[in-house]
């Protein structure tokens, strides 16, 4: 008799793939554009990334540090009208892209939460949640919650409103904190909250602490669904050197949870390479004309256009990983088991029942190294085969689809491998 299939977990839409943050409409669209109508024209691009949700804004009216002139129900006219927003929502829905609205109140000011008028602001947020839920948004984001007094109780209340409207609505909270205890205390008081933090940004410029940070986090959060990013808003290049971007893409897409990216992460957008551009929101490089300030500063391989034409680019890797993440059961909701492989190596298995299984091996070292995969660390349900097929490498030169002997697996400096193998009874 065939073994019984394991019962599938309830899957919400944000469990099925990545979220894509566009915090600055003008920087994202460039060329003096930057409104909701223009963003609608970029939805096909988001579809090509296979992301499941767009985290937008804030786009509400906010006079810097002026609570009276901050209206969470009104769209800043610079970004467009309510009609433009409704139109964007409709178009996004047709493309199966959910829209999450950032309601961080004082986003243009010093303290995101007007620290002296917390209750006034909290009431405004409550009203805004109800208003925008009726308008059809799929969720909300609030950032800098470390600046919000009694954050846990406010988040619980806002979560109740959001979930009370529909279980299919999401609340994301963002914090600059990287402290695990602070993060856990926020999570403990809010069951379904998705929390973005700076936790992984402590992994070091060499990625040396990545493995321990990830495993500690997963051990501490248990079966809870989590999100993966390096900060609540900033680009990966703010924290990582170029040679680690591909490794982190592979990791973020294959860990259990929702990967959250900022616009430009898919092409390795780096403010440091664009003189005069703000670190937190550099202009998106659609093509070589996107940054006309300094002629020749932008080469084709830094742009969406250039990388779209290159199968070995970071963008192509992002698209492939996003596609795998959204369709493979083991990556969607599979179990996770990390195991030893050698210095600088982070290796883990994702598996679900009798579905195809995935082995991830990441070399954070700047040396080529043989992976000594310690299968003895794994439970019987997640044993390793002798060979696995190479689905992709973060570096060019390997023959994809070919079976690799796991006993003789050798990785290049800063290489990551995604391998697949079938379930064996």
């Amino acid at each position: 008799r065939a073994p019984r299939c394991r019962e599938l977990p309830a899957q919400k839409w944000w469990h099925t793939g990545a979220l894509y943050r566009i915090g600055d409409l003008q920087a994202f669209q460039g060329h003096g554009a930057g409104n909701l109508a223009g963003l609608k024209g970029r939805l096909d691009y988001l579809s090509s990334l296979k992301v499941k949700g767009l985290v937008l804004g804030p786009i509400h009216k906010n006079q810097k540090d002026d609570v009276a002139q901050t209206d969470l129900l009104q769209i800043d006219p610079n970004f467009g009208s309510k009609e433009d927003f409704d139109s964007l929502l409709q178009s996004a829905k047709k493309k199966s892209i959910r829209v999450i609205l950032d309601l961080t109140p004082n986003y243009r000011g010093e303290n995101s939460w007007f620290s002296t008028q917390v209750d006034t602001v909290a009431t405004k947020v409550k009203d805004a949640l109800e208003f925008w839920l009726q308008a059809g948004v799929d969720g909300f984001q609030v950032r800098d919650i470390e600046n919000l007094k009694d954050a846990s109780s406010f988040l619980a209340e806002w979560q109740n409103i959001t979930k009370g409207f529909s279980e299919d609505r999401l609340l994301i909270a963002g914090t600059n904190s990287s402290d695990l205890q602070q993060i856990l205390s926020l999570l403990e008081s809010n069951k379904d909250l998705l929390l973005t933090s700076s936790y992984l940004s402590d992994s070091g410029s060499t990625g040396e602490h990545t493995k321990s940070l990830v495993t500690q986090y997963l051990n501490a959060t248990g079966n809870r669904w989590c999100s993966w990013s390096l900060s609540q808003a900033r680009l990966l290049t703010s924290f990582l050197p170029a040679q680690l971007l591909r490794l982190y893409q592979l990791m973020l897409f294959t860990l259990p949870g929702t990967p959250v990216f900022s616009y430009g992460d898919e092409i390795g957008l780096d403010a440091a390479a664009l003189p005069g551009q703000p670190m937190e929101a550099p202009v998106m490089l659609w093509d070589e004309s996107s940054f006309p300030d300094i002629p020749g500063a932008v080469s084709a391989n830094m742009t969406v256009k250039g990388q779209s034409e290159d199968p070995g680019s970071l963008l192509s890797l992002f698209r492939r990983l996003s596609d795998q993440r959204s369709k493979e059961r083991s990556l969607l909701h599979g179990d996770f088991h990390a195991f030893s492989a050698g210095p600088g190596l982070f290796s883990y298995i994702r598996h679900w029942d009798q579905n195809e299984r995935f082995l991830v091996v990441l070399n954070f070292g700047d040396v080529g190294l043989s992976a000594g995969l310690q299968a003895s660390d794994l439970p019987a349900s997640a044993s390793l085969p002798a060979k696995a097929d190479l689905l992709l490498s973060t570096q060019p030169g390997r023959e994809e689809g070919s079976p690799l002997e796991l006993e003789r697996l050798k990785l290049e400096p800063h290489e990551g491998l995604l391998l697949r193998f079938p379930y064996a009874a």
């Epitope: 070091g204 040679q243 600088g344 400096p413």
Partner: antibody, heavy 119, light 113 residues
Framework: QVQLVQSGAEVKKPGASVKVSCKAS????????MHWVRQAPGQGLEWMGI????????NYAQKFQGRVTSTVDKSISTAYMELSRLRSDDTVVYYC????????????WGQGTLVTVSS | DIVMTQSPDSLAVSLGERATINCKSS????????????LAWYQQKPGQPPKLLIY???TRESGVPDRFSGSGSGTDFTLTISSLQAEDVAVYYC?????????FGGGTKVEIK
């Protein structure tokens, strides 16, 4: 300043084991890799293996696989290299050498430990 | 394993003159991703451990005099001492730090003529 101080010279019989220690000071022990390199008298250098003190993950040269074991004691910032089934051609100077995380070149070396294997 | 071959075995140079040591690897040490060559040079004096001089083929370790310079790419590398000093008498080793097992050249003994 960074210092790697190794244990003293040893004389061992063939078939026995030797354990060489390397005490680190002047830096954060767990933030750097420790390599072991050996050198026969008047000869060249030979890499043996590596340990990441933060999680004790190891990697060894094929030639020494099964005979060498690297360990660390983080509480006293000390790395150890044990070589078993000693033969006469293991009569060499053993060095511990520090490398930045993820690197394969060595910026600080211990003073060396001479191990003599003789019956 | 990557084999490292050094030449010459020994070299006698007058004080103040240039000394050149060559190192060849059996496979390329150029990482195409970051365009760096993973080659290091060490100096070893009698009774002492080796001392790092150069890494990534041409990056001088801090505190190393600028008369020491490294060059080359792919499989062919050179260590140059532009003006030999008495304290430079030693054995010099190249080492590939691209891939485990990390391998060394056989060494070049530099003496004063």
């Amino acid at each position: 300043q960074v210092q790697l101080v190794q244990s003293g010279a040893e004389v061992k019989k063939p078939g026995a084991s030797v354990k060489v220690s390397c005490k680190a000071s002047g830096y954060t022990f767990t933030s750097y890799w420790m390599h072991w390199v050996r050198q026969a008298p008047g000869q060249g250098l030979e890499w043996m293996g590596i340990i990441d003190p933060s999680d004790s993950e190891t990697n060894y040269a094929q030639k020494f696989q099964g005979r060498v074991t690297s360990t660390v004691d983080k509480s006293i910032s000390t790395a150890y290299m044990e070589l078993s089934r000693l033969r006469s051609d293991d009569t060499v100077v053993y060095y511990c050498a520090r490398a930045s995380y993820g690197k394969g070149y060595f910026d600080y070396w211990g003073q060396g430990t001479l191990v003599t294997v003789s019956s | 394993d990557i084999v490292m071959t050094q030449s010459p075995d020994s070299l006698a140079v007058s004080l103040g003159e240039r000394a050149t040591i060559n190192c060849k690897s059996s496979q390329s040490l150029l990482n195409n991703i970051n365009q760096k060559n993973y080659l290091a040079w060490y100096q070893q004096k009698p009774g002492q451990p080796p001392k790092l001089l150069i890494y990534f083929a041409s990056t001088r370790e801090s505190g190393v005099p600028d008369r020491f310079s490294g060059s080359g790419s792919g499989t062919d590398f050179t260590l140059t001492i532009s003006s030999l000093q008495a304290e430079d008498v030693a054995v010099y080793y190249c080492q590939q730090h691209y891939s485990s097992p990390f391998t060394f050249g056989g060494g070049t003994k530099v003496e004063i003529k």
